[in-house]
């Protein structure tokens, strides 16, 4: 398919000018490429019209230009003095005519109105409102006022003084006539329909001697705003409908076949399901104005999409309208990752997110979606040192691997934390990704004690049992802070004895505290990583106590305190059932989503059948 | 529960200076931004300036851009509004609010986004 968009249709009136603007991938080649119009002819070819490299076709020759703006992506062609000869078939393209990097466009030109004389025109969009004067003589003050609509050769009555009104406009036209000093009435039609677009004729008496004013009332179907946007990227639809519906229901539809428009969210509390967990909208201004934000760009996300005000919240005739024609570029630069990730009760996530490396001085900042009335994303952290209260020393946001990708890691899952969470960054807006944690069944992988208290003054040992597949994983111990977890020095105790069916290659690795503090206490993760690359984690809190014997204390998975629902097992470990504990500190054992074979790699996307990617899983 | 008490307001004249205080008791760890509002008779409640609790970074209204300054001290868990060139349209009851649990897409500068409020001080300005 090819990359290029704009727009499918224009249409102008003879004697008018047209501004077409195309939108390209912004690549180095393309931003230098030759950018052309051309016509395309009955048997297949298309005849150069204006191109970047200054050629402009004698038909073009004064009224045409064709403006690149690389640093975009598009370019635009300005046509001037169209005529109908102008109606046809074009392309906007890159390259050579023929290689299809194009666009069709198709140009209608057509003769402007055939107006009597003394017309005022009134243009006005779709599904607003319009007011047609009507003047008249003092002796037609006390007489009949009336508004017909030409229908073809014949007026008919739309509305009258005496109260008439014609079926086509009840609920939406009244007749307003000024007071006795003015010598004018009106007649207001609100909530605009194509088919009232035409010829009117205001009239007041009804003999030879009545007044009349001819109208042309032209209702304008808003053109679409074109929109071109990566894939996997971010879009953003700006709805200023005017404080006139500012308190009428709003909604986001997209056009399916002919004339239908599905509804994707409105603020009644719909939303389609294919936008589950990538849709906001987020609260509208007192005038009336909102957005819609989607992230996780699919292909199937492109078409024509309308916003607009009605009190069924959704698309009906006369509903003031805006659009968008949103093309999705295939061809994109943010870089795939995993759209799902999964953990078990009492294990952790490390989620992987893209950003615009040109922007790595940008604040990052994760968001768990809600999906309740118009959706919205309160934030859990940040990487200026912000994390939600009740997820400290649980979350860290670290700028690691760094160059367009940073990580979050969140332990102690619980079935609560399954949902859609949302990557953005203060920078560049269409970087916005969303990832799904799912949680899973299965053990986490680490295993470390529960709560642990350590006595002021003494030393304290917390163990940390690594299973073999974590052989040739970076094994750490750190202490979590709310800018990250600083890296502790830790020691190799040797093979554990943890795990059955797991041979030398486990490790046991253990965290020493010397002279024990009060500035001690706290969340300890233990974790594997593969350079810059984050896999499972454990969390221990460590809580400090006044001394009552001396010695040091070694603690071991049996001797922490047994929270409840856990069952201290003969061999020394405690094993949590998979239940969700309300206080984080009483999480004993750990266990990440994927495979931190995936996380740690380079590629770390493993792709499942359907369309959504997913991050590890070998626990199934 | 956060407690906020506003401070510093009173009676000055065109041209001076007032500096508020903002103390919060029982502040969370984990505020995300201060913000101060202020409110004339009569009118709505107007955005002032804000400032990130981490990072420090700072938002103002157009009307005070350049003559007021909103500045934190972490130690003594208090925000600061220093009111400079002051004008009788500045007039009014200003607030203090702290917001601990931010949207992705809120707007500070709206007094929606904000659970704790104070019970503001009276700024009078004479000309």
């Known amino acids: 398919k090819s990359p290029i968009f704009g727009p499918e249709e224009v249409n102008s009136v003879e004697g008018n000018s047209v501004s077409i603007t195309c939108y390209y991938p912004p690549t180095s080649v393309n931003r230098h490429t030759r950018k052309y119009w051309c016509r395309q002819g009955a048997r297949g070819g298309c005849i150069t019209l204006i191109s970047s490299e200054g050629y402009v076709s004698s038909k073009y020759a004064g009224r045409a230009n064709l403006t690149n703006f690389p640093e975009n992506g598009t370019f635009v062609v300005n046509i001037a003095q169209l005529s109908q000869d102008d109606s046809g078939r074009y392309k906007c393209g890159l390259g050579i005519n023929s290689r299809g990097l194009s666009f069709d466009v198709s140009l209608e030109v057509s003769q402007g109105p055939g107006l009597l004389n003394d017309t005022k025109v009134y243009t006005v969009d779709l599904g607003r409102t319009v007011t047609i004067n009507c003047p008249f003589k003092t002796e037609n003050a006390q007489k009949r006022k009336s508004l017909y609509k030409q229908i073809g050769l014949y007026p008919v009555l739309v509305i009258d003084s005496s109260g008439y009104v014609n079926p086509n406009y009840t609920g939406r036209i009244r007749l307003d006539i000024q007071g006795t000093g003015q010598l004018l009435f009106s007649v207001v039609i609100n909530q605009l329909r194509l088919s009232d677009a035409g010829q009117y004729l205001c009239q007041a008496g009804d003999d030879s001697n009545s007044n009349k004013k001819n109208a042309d009332l032209q209702v304008l179907k808003p053109e679409p705003e074109l929109v071109y946007e990566d894939l996997r990227g971010s879009v953003t639809f700006h709805c200023a409908l005017g404080p006139e519906v500012a308190n009428v229901a709003k909604f986001l539809c997209r056009q399916s076949s002919g004339e239908n428009c599905d509804v994707v969210v409105n603020t009644l509390g719909k939303r389609a399901p294919a936008f589950e967990g990538r849709i906001l909208l987020n609260p509208q201004d007192k005038d009336g104005s909102f957005s819609v934000v989607i992230t996780g760009l699919r292909k199937e996300d492109a078409g024509r999409y309308l916003c607009g005000a009605h009190s069924d919240g959704q698309l009906q005739e006369g509903s003031p309208i805006q659009a968008w024609q949103l093309f999705v570029n295939e061809e994109s630069t943010i870089p795939r990752s995993p759209t799902v990730v999964k953990g078990v009760a009492g294990g952790s996530v490390a989620v992987l997110c893209p950003y615009n490396r040109k922007e790595s001085k940008s604040i990052k900042y994760w968001c768990l979606w809600e999906g309740a009335q118009n959706g919205r994303c309160p934030l859990l952290v940040d990487s200026e040192g912000w994390v939600k209260a009740q997820y400290e020393g649980r979350l860290s946001l670290l700028e690691e691997p760094g160059n367009g990708t940073f990580t979050v890691i969140l332990n102690q899952l619980t079935s609560r934390d399954a949902g859609f969470y949302w990557c953005l960054t203060n920078g560049d807006t269409l970087w916005r990704t969303t990832v799904e944690i799912k949680i899973i069944e299965g053990e986490p992988n680490l295993k470390v004690p529960g709560n642990v208290t350590a006595v002021l003054g003494e030393t304290l040992k917390v163990p940390c049992h690594f299973p073999c597949k974590f052989s040739s994983y970076e094994k750490y111990w750190c202490k979590w802070n709310n800018t990250g977890c600083q890296a502790l020095p830790s020691q190799d105790e040797g093979p554990s004895k943890a795990f059955v069916n797991c041979d030398e290659n486990s490790r046991l690795v253990s965290l020493t505290l010397n002279l024990v503090t009060r500035a001690d206490e706290g969340w300890y993760w233990c974790g594997v990583k593969q350079g810059h690359f984050y896999g499972e984690t454990a969390a221990v809190y460590v809580a400090v106590e006044e001394r009552k014997a001396a010695g040091s204390r070694d603690v071991s998975l049996a001797k922490a305190d047994a929270a409840p629902d856990e069952k201290v097992l003969d061999s020394g470990f405690r094993e949590i059932e998979n239940k969700a504990i309300q206080d984080p500190r009483l999480f004993a054992e750990e266990k990440a989503v994927a495979d931190t074979r995936d996380q740690a790699d380079g590629s770390r996307a493993s792709v499942d059948s359907g369309s959504s990617e997913e991050q590890g899983g070998s626990s199934r | 529960q956060v407690q906020l008490v506003e401070s510093g307001g009173g009676l000055v004249q065109a041209g001076g200076s007032l500096r508020l205080s903002c103390a919060a008791n029982g502040r969370a760890a984990n505020a995300y931004a201060v913000g101060w509002f202020r409110q004339a008779p009569g009118k709505e409640r107007e955005f002032v300036a804000h400032?990130?609790?981490?990072?420090?970074?700072?938002a103002y209204a157009d009307s005070v851009k350049g003559r007021f300054t909103i500045s934190r001290d972490d130690a003594k868990n208090t925000v600061y509004l220093q009111m400079d060139s002051l004008k009788p349209e500045d007039t009014a009851v200003y607030y203090c609010?702290?917001?601990?649990?931010?949207?992705?897409?809120?707007?500070?500068?709206?007094?929606?986004?904000?659970?704790?409020w104070g019970q503001g001080t009276q700024v009078t300005v004479s000309s």
């Open positions: 400032i990130r609790w981490n990072g420090g970074r700072t």
């Open positions: 609010a702290e917001d601990t649990n931010p949207d992705a897409f809120g707007d500070l500068r709206l007094p929606s986004e904000y659970e704790y």
